[in-house]
Every structure is written in structure tokens, then in C-alpha cells.
């Protein structure tokens, strides 16, 4: 677990959990055939999702210099997606069964974010957009978009933790 003062997180644990997240994100949103919903109006919903960008210090040099910038960015993203996955977008219709990988994904996002959150220290979290789609087709479209961007996010996070586990672990 990360501790105050910018100590390193448990890189290996984070690596394992982020790999699990990658697997879950793909099983929650496998490649669907032609999506008849795609043309149904493109809300700006997923424009605000967190992305890991060049300035976030997640490159090998940035991680060596001060991994906290990158870890904070990853933490923000995990909390953002965890809130989205617990929202009406995923709890409303179309109904998800209790064995859905979305449920496991939700729990794993929370687990990894807790590994990164320093004790007694609260990183700023990003506001999630207030989305309350009323129609099942709107919800389903949002699910697919959110899961697609989550796949990209956790893929980058997993690479960061793999690099950290290989080169930065004590």
C-alpha cells in the first residue's frame, strides 16, 4: 500500500490487480457484432473520461523521477470509472445478472484504487458527469463507450505497473 510522503506502492500487487482489470474489462465488453445503437445519437458522455497523457509522468523517466504524479492520475481514473460502474448506467435496464463481469470489474477498480490511496491522504478526484439516460438504448450505448475507454485506460495502467514492478520495486 502507498504511504504518505510519496513512498512507492506495492508495485507487484498493483501489477497483478491491473492485469486482472484488463481481463475483466475485455470480458465485460467483448467485441460485439455490428452495433445497431451506434447511430442512435452520440452524447458527449465519454469525452470527459480520464485519459493518461504525455504530461502525466507515466513514462519510464517520469516514473523514475516521481511516480506520485502518474499514480495520482491513475487513482483519479480508477475512482472515476468505479463511480460510473456503480451508477444507473450499469444498474438500470438492460439488466445485468449478478454474475456479470461488470460487478467484478467494479470491485477490482475499488481494490486497486485503495492500494494506491495513501493513508490519511486524499487525492483530488475528478467529478463524474451527471448522466441519467432514461432509455435502455441510451444506457447500453453509454455502457459500451465507457467500457471501451476503460479498456484503454486499464491497459495503460497495467503497463505502468508492469514497468514499476520490473524496475522500481524495492
Amino acid at each position: 500500500r502507498a504511504v504518505p510522503g510519496g513512498s512507492s506502492p506495492a508495485w507487484t500487487q498493483c501489477q497483478q490487480l491491473s492485469q486482472k482489470l484488463c481481463t475483466l474489462a475485455w470480458s465485460a465488453h467483448p467485441l460485439v457484432g455490428h452495433m445497431d445503437l451506434r447511430e442512435e445519437g452520440d452524447e458527449e458522455t465519454t469525452n470527459d473520461v480520464p485519459h493518461i497523457q504525455c504530461g502525466d509522468g507515466c513514462d519510464p523517466q517520469g516514473l523514475r523521477d516521481n511516480s506520485q504524479f502518474c499514480l495520482q492520475r491513475i487513482h483519479q481514473g480508477l475512482i472515476f470509472y468505479e463511480k460510473l460502474l456503480g451508477s444507473d448506467i450499469f444498474t438500470g435496464e438492460p439488466s445485468l445478472l449478478p454474475d456479470s463481469p461488470v460487478g467484478q470489474l467494479h470491485a477490482s477498480l475499488l481494490g486497486l484504487s485503495q492500494l494506491l490511496q495513501p493513508e490519511g491522504h486524499h487525492w483530488e478526484t475528478q467529478q463524474i458527469p451527471s448522466l441519467s439516460p432514461s432509455q435502455p438504448w441510451q444506457r447500453l450505448l453509454l455502457r459500451f463507450k465507457i467500457l471501451r475507454s476503460l479498456q484503454a485506460f486499464v491497459a495503460v495502467a497495467a503497463r505502468v505497473f508492469a514497468h514499476g514492478a520490473a524496475t522500481l520495486s524495492p
Epitope: S27, A28, P30, V32, G33, H34, M35, D36, L37, E93, P94, S95, L96, L97, P98, D99, S100, P101, V102, G103, Q135, P136, W137, R139, L140, L141
Partner: antibody
Framework: QVQLVQSGAEVKKPGSSVKTSCKAS????????IHWVRQRPGQGLEWMGY????????KYNENFKGRVTITADKSTSTAYMELSSLRSEDTAVYYC?????????????WGQGTLVTVSS | DIQMTQSPSSLSASVGDRVTITCKAS??????VAWYQQKPGKVPKLLLY???TRHTGVPSRFSGSGSRTDFTLTISSLQPEDVATYYC?????????FGSGTKLEIK
């Protein structure tokens, strides 16, 4: 490959109960919902409910007005469906089915069905 | 409950014909619709899910389309082995419901 094997045919009197079983193999029993669907003679399909063995939580089709009880025995990887206060209209083939692992309820695996005949 | 109104209830067509079965949901189900084939005396078999995605091993002559309330199953070139009853199924809302079935025969 998941396989579902159901118990044999039953003949029951009106007003009585029937309990049919569905034994699953080839998958992780606790990790998937097991659904029950019935088909009356010459009729369509009717979803009755499911059980999620991991936490023993069932969900029912309220159209059965509390007559259906779905349970699971994790030790034997078997799900059960009990229907009470039987009437002649309950004569049907009762199937257990397991959906895809995506978390949505399209049914990939089906048991062979159990014919329940309700007759005086 | 969401009603799935399927039509026609039965149809007879010749080998090689293009066959279309429709299903209308009583309210929006997005694309949360599956189609099953049930041959006489057999168990239902999944053909399509998400309205248009073919299940593993299903021949390409079977296709589906539609969203929200109107859905279609099409068999592009009818084969003798396609004689069966076809059911649509919505898995958007509890209780999950099925269409009443379309019995397909060969002329």
C-alpha cells in the same frame, strides 16, 4: 463445456408440489446464474427465475405468485426448482439454462428438460 | 412485463427462399434481444444475441437486425434443416420474456 443434466419425468396431482433438479458440470457452479424456463405443450417459452449459487440469491418471475422456489446445493453443483399448488396448466417441460458469461441473459446451455404432468 | 409480439405464427416456404420473422417489443429493449431455434422434440438452441450477433457455429444464412422495439430474423436461403420453431427473447427487463414462436415449414 458446460453440461446440464435434469431429473426424470414426474406425474403429480393438482394441489401438490414438484421439485426438479439440474446438475451442472464443466464450469464453476458458483460463478454463474442458473435459470429455469418452462414450455407448456404446443406453447412458447416462459422464464421462471434464477439462482446465483455464490450468494444463494434467487430472482423470480412474479407471475408465478410465490409458487416457485429455486435453490442450489453448492456441494453437488445442483440447482432445484420447486413449484407448489400445482394445477393442470402447469403441465410442461421445465428446462434449466445457463447464460453467456457476459452478464446478460441470453441462454447458451440448456438441460434436456423435465416433463411434469399434472393430472388427477 | 414486456410483451414480445412475434409474427407470423407459422409460415411455409420453399428451399432457397428468403424468410423473415419479426418481433415487436411493447417497449424499448435497446438491442437486448436473442433468437432461438427449436426443432421438434429438441431443446432450444441460441442463434443470435444483441439482436444481430451470430452465436458460435450458427450458419451465416441466419442474420438479425433491429433496435429498441422492432426486430427481424432473416434466413437468406432456406434449407431443409431449418424446419423448426423460432423464438425471440428480450433480456433487457425482468421478467425476461419470449415471443410466442414462429413455426417454419418447407412447402
Amino acid at each position: 463445456q458446460v453440461q446440464l443434466v435434469q431429473s426424470g419425468a414426474e406425474v403429480k396431482k393438482p394441489g401438490s408440489s414438484v421439485k426438479t433438479s439440474c446438475k451442472a458440470s464443466g464450469g464453476t457452479f458458483t460463478d454463474q446464474t442458473i435459470h429455469w424456463v418452462r414450455q407448456r405443450p404446443g406453447q412458447g417459452l416462459e422464464w421462471m427465475g434464477y439462482i446465483y449459487p455464490r450468494d444463494d440469491s434467487p430472482k423470480y418471475n412474479e407471475n408465478f405468485k410465490g409458487r416457485v422456489t429455486i435453490t442450489a446445493d453448492k456441494s453437488t453443483s445442483t440447482a432445484y426448482m420447486e413449484l407448489s399448488s400445482l394445477r393442470s396448466e402447469d403441465t410442461a417441460v421445465y428446462y434449466c439454462a445457463i447464460p453467456d458469461r457476459s452478464g446478460y441473459a441470453w441462454f447458451i446451455y440448456w438441460g434436456q428438460g423435465t416433463l411434469v404432468t399434472v393430472s388427477s | 412485463d414486456i410483451q414480445m409480439t412475434q409474427s407470423p405464427s407459422s409460415l411455409s416456404a420453399s428451399v432457397g427462399d428468403r424468410v423473415t420473422i419479426t418481433c415487436k417489443a411493447s417497449r424499448d429493449v435497446a438491442i437486448a434481444v436473442a433468437w432461438y431455434q427449436q426443432k421438434p422434440g429438441k431443446v432450444p438452441k441460441l442463434l443470435l444475441y444483441w439482436a444481430s450477433t451470430r452465436h458460435t457455429g450458427v450458419p451465416s444464412r441466419f442474420s438479425g437486425s433491429g433496435s429498441r422495439t422492432d426486430f427481424t430474423l432473416t434466413i437468406s436461403s432456406l434449407q431443409p434443416e431449418d424446419v423448426a420453431t423460432y423464438y425471440c427473447h428480450q433480456y433487457s427487463s425482468y421478467p425476461f420474456t419470449f415471443g410466442s414462436g414462429t413455426k417454419l415449414e418447407i412447402k
